[in-house]
């Protein structure tokens, strides 16, 4: 999906009002020095592409993020504020339902959500010129 035509300000508002708090709740109890962000993004469409991938694509050691509160709110925000996004996700959602697993918060998931926090922060401030 091409995120170029999303309403970025509306997504930013959804992030600040709800998604950010759910991410903090998920990460509560972890040390602020525990994880090192290795994923970055350079502009808002790029940030949303990375956020979508990390939130909804199962990875080795962390298959369960899509059912978390922050993920459901992310999905809702993208569906509302990105034209045509929900249509592109129908097949992906059906495939995900087939492989749904019990929610387990692993260290790998915590690391992944730490990466997501960094991506969302960069989405929130997409104002930087590369030196």
């Amino acid at each position: 999906y091409d995120f170029t035509n999303c309403d970025f300000e509306k997504i930013k508002a959804a992030y600040l009002s709800t998604i950010s708090k759910d991410l903090i709740t998920y990460m509560s109890g972890t040390k602020s020095t525990e994880f090192n962000n290795t994923v970055s993004c350079s502009n808002r469409p790029h940030c949303l592409t990375e956020i979508q991938s990390l939130t909804f694509n199962p990875t080795a050691g962390c298959a369960s993020l899509a059912k978390e509160m922050f993920a459901m709110k992310t999905k809702a925000a993208l569906a509302i504020w990105c034209p045509g996004y929900s249509e592109t996700q129908i097949n992906a959602t059906q495939a995900m339902k087939k492989r749904r697993k019990r929610k387990v918060t692993t260290n790998k998931c915590l690391e992944q959500v730490s990466q997501l926090q960094g991506l969302w922060r960069r989405f929130n401030r997409p104002l930087l010129k590369q030196q």
Epitope: E9, N36, Q117, G118, R121, N124, R125, Q130
Partner: antibody
Amino acid sequence: EVQLVQSGAEVKKPGASVKVSCKASGYTFTNYFIDWVRQAPGQGLEWIGVIDAFSGGSNFNEKFKGRVTMTRDTSTSTAYMELSSLRSEDTAVYFCARESEVGEGFAYWGQGTLVTVSS
Amino acid sequence: DIQMTQSPSSLSASVGDRVTISCRASQDISNYLNWYQQKPGKAPKLLIYYTSTLHSGVPSRFSGSGSGTDYTLTISSLQPEDIATYFCQQGNTLPYTFGQGTKLEIK
């Protein structure tokens, strides 16, 4: 505990440059942006600019165009702000500040570095 | 640049009083409004971000509200340790800009 420790006070002559450092600890340095803000004696706050500690990307207040350079050293978790062509009105306390967890607002501040510009 | 205007510039109140400080932006800042507290010789402290979200560790007697161009910081019951200068800051548009400050004193 998040801490930002800045370099000591500086006295500079007009036309000179100053480089202020900001050493971060208590969090993963490259995960956050660092902003620079100054405060002239008895005055309000003025935003200078911001650097992404991960990429080194930066942006700054156009007021300081051509005079400010922001850099960082990830090996020492230190951010730097250099201001050149100093004039008397640059006399101020210079603060570094880290963004909040959500990227909105300046949540953690250094203790400030007094830069005095005087002939 | 967006101009931020605070009122009043100074304020005297008694312990236990409800105190409100106003901040007006020269254009709509879409709720990207933060509040800071600064005590003499110290760095500012973030109190509230995005108009009304309390930063971690900030007492619940502090609250924020507003929209568009007009925003308010409220202290529901003034405590002696709240004596400080308060600044608003807009985070909507670069360059970020601050209000001139409101100095709060005890009667």
